[in-house]
């Protein structure tokens, strides 16, 4: 059946899915927070320049009873029942607003008519990518999986004289929705990655990536692994590793790298961390005061994804233009708007770009410090320390493969 | 209506630091992000930095170094702190209600002399 | 940093006159914002996203372009429209301003 869109005659609803089973393990409360002071803001917006309409959102809760694990591995099912719920209320906003789980996003996209925007706090695996009237405003695993190769090809600067083909990638199955995707998407053997390196290996017992760290016939220097330092403390320990050895600690969204009195432990003296670029400092609004580094991001990215839909919203009014039209669904791309905490750009899929930050722990001064940075959106990475103090012989990252590292 | 406001030293003596007070009325601080914005005497507009909706600031590249910008929301005021000024500093220095469809509200300026 | 760049620095035209300036970008920007500002008076945003006449401008101002090539027109020019005018990126750093271009009445 037919299901209207309360989306127009001056009045304009937000359709947001408050799914049990997300990204990020976040009480619905703070995101429902988070939405209605975009809402606030984007009503400000819009009546700073003159357009007098409403904006509401209508939040659609799934049935916690059926659908209680929590994490991502049952929102498939939780999708296609809350698009179940809209269709038999017969009722839907000018936008759709979550899933975060890949599985349940791939879904929903499948089974819906594309004629609304979904934007998505999450939806981070490549399936996800490509999407017309898709929005993701986490950085999803193509962006990772890009820097990742462009970093592995540099070889003309002066902390890396090598270009780089080989990757171990340790991957156990507990990691968390985002890094499960990141890693997914290293794993996988069609991916840009894999078609990329010329030789690349999944470890996916704890015991395999030990054994890698001192293997004089291991076939590459170089781990890649996702989460924070006390995931790699847990599987590390104080173990002794090989001089040549790299390990990538993919972990995007936690900037307590760049608090002022943290210090970095011995045990990451070998790690280079990728992280996002912090994020400008909040003040205390009522969506972010308790929340972790990780979920300020997660709701971050709802709150954004309100302002995203007010920026559309009063473009498409201003210049008179219907909102429920395939145009409007497929608008929310290739375009920059003012984020809550700044400019968020969006590439031609509708793909949040940022700045990654590649750290290094200074044997100095026991701090985080910048290597380099990339732009997601230009695809291209900027050098900071040119002379970095490392661990690495003569401050330069070995070569990828045992035995043929800096002299 | 909307107003902007600024209220500055006057006078600065040089590698002093300048503290400039923007208060604005007609609008709230928690639903429009604010531009600091200079001009020299006789040339043009250089933007100086913005502080967001959510209190994060972004500023010229060439002055970062050299500026803060923070609010208070409840008191509807913006500040912007310049440090170690020289005589090229020298300028009206603007507040301008900012978004990404241009500054449409600006202040009327404050002028700084640097000065000893 | 993206640079804005208008030409030309100074211009004079005549009542009546067409009148076009022009605002060239160092890289590609999504849009650009207008300012107009006579002597001793605060800039007053005049034209914005590209095209978009601010509320009092007179119609005979428009704005077009995209990329790295923007530019103003005035279909006939009168004397109030003497001014220095100003254009305005948001797509790097996040803004940064042209040095101007002084519109003088003959």
């Known amino acids: 059946s037919q299901v209207s869109q309360n989306c127009h005659n001056g009045s304009y609803e937000i359709s947001v899915l408050m799914m049990g089973n997300s990204a990020f393990a976040e009480p619905l409360k703070n995101l429902e927070d988070a939405v209605n002071e975009g809402l606030e803001i984007v009503r400000g917006r819009l009546q700073n320049a003159g357009l007098n309409v409403t904006v509401n959102a209508t939040f659609m809760y799934s049935d916690g009873l059926i659908h209680n694990s929590g994490d991502c591995r049952s929102s498939t099912c939780e999708g296609l029942d809350l698009l179940r719920k809209i269709s038999n209320a017969q009722r839907m906003g000018c936008v759709l607003i979550g899933p975060s789980c890949t599985y349940s996003t791939f879904q929903m996209y499948l089974d819906t008519e594309l004629s609304y925007p979904m934007i998505s706090a999450g939806s981070f695996g490549l399936s996800c990518d490509y999407k017309e009237t898709l929005t993701r405003l986490m950085s999803p695993a193509r962006k990772l999986m890009y820097f990742l190769v462009n970093f592995w090809k540099t070889n003309d600067l002066p902390f890396k004289t090598y270009s780089w083909s080989t990757s171990y990638v340790y991957k156990n199955g507990t990691e968390t929705e985002d890094c499960f995707w990141y890693l997914n998407a290293l794993e996988a053997s069609v991916s840009y990655f894999s078609h990329e390196l010329g030789f690349k290996v999944v470890l996916r017992q704890d015991k395999e990536f030990q054994d890698i760290l001192m293997d004089h016939n291991r076939k590459s220097n170089v781990i890649i692994m996702c989460g924070g330092p006390e995931f790699l403390y847990k599987l590390k320990g104080d173990r002794a590793v090989a001089e040549d050895i790299v390990i990538i600690l993919v972990d995007l969204f936690n900037d307590q790298y760049f608090e002022d009195n943290v210090t970095a432990p011995d045990y990451m003296k070998n790690v280079l961390v990728l992280t996002l670029s912090p994020g400008n400092s909040l003040l205390n609004s009522s969506f972010s005061r308790n929340l972790s580094p990780t979920k300020r991001d997660f709701a971050l990215a709802y709150l954004n994804g309100i302002l995203l839909f007010g920026h559309m919203l009063k473009i498409f009014l201003e210049n008179g233009e219907n909102i429920t039209t395939p145009k409007f669904a497929h608008a929310f791309r290739n375009l920059t708007f003012e984020g809550y905490d700044g400019p968020v750009t969006l590439d031609d899929w509708g793909d949040v770009d940022s700045t990654m930050v590649l750290l290094y722990t200074s044997v100095d001064t026991k701090k985080y410090k910048v290597l380099l940075t990339y732009d997601t959106h230009v695809n291209k990475t900027y050098p900071v320390d040119m002379s970095p103090t490392f661990t690495w012989k003569n401050s330069k990252l070995p070569n990828d493969i045992t035995g043929r590292g800096p002299q | 209506q909307v107003q902007l406001k600024e209220s500055g030293p006057g006078l600065v003596a040089p590698s002093q630091s300048l503290s400039i007070t923007c208060t604005v009325s007609?609008?709230?601080?928690?639903?429009?992000?604010i531009s600091w914005v200079r001009q020299p005497p006789g040339k043009g507009l250089e933007w100086l930095g913005v502080i967001w909706t959510g209190g994060g600031t972004n500023y010229n590249s060439a002055l970062k170094s050299r500026l803060s910008i923070r609010k208070e929301n409840s008191k509807s005021q913006v500040f912007l702190k310049m440090n170690s000024l020289q005589t090229e500093d020298t300028a009206r220095y603007f507040c301008?209600?900012?978004?990404?469809?241009?500054?449409?509200?600006w202040g009327q300026g404050t002028l700084v002399t640097v000065s000893a | 940093q993206i640079v804005l760049t208008q030409s030309p620095a100074i211009m004079s035209a005549s009542p009546g006159e067409k009148v076009t300036m022009t605002c060239s970008a160092s890289?590609?920007?999504?849009?650009m914002h207008w300012y107009q500002q006579k002597s001793g008076t605060s800039p007053k945003r005049w034209i914005y996203d590209t095209s978009k006449l601010a509320s009092g401008v007179p119609a005979r101002f428009s704005g077009s372009g995209s990329g790295t090539s923007y530019s103003l027109t005035i279909t006939s020019m009168e004397a109030e429209d003497a001014a220095t005018y100003y254009c305005q990126q948001w797509s790097g750093n996040p803004y940064t301003f042209g040095g101007g271009t002084k519109l003088e009445i003959k």
């Open positions: 007609g609008f709230s601080l928690s639903r429009n992000a």
């Open positions: 301008a209600r900012s978004g990404y469809d241009g500054f449409d509200y």
């Open positions: 890289s590609s920007v999504n849009y």
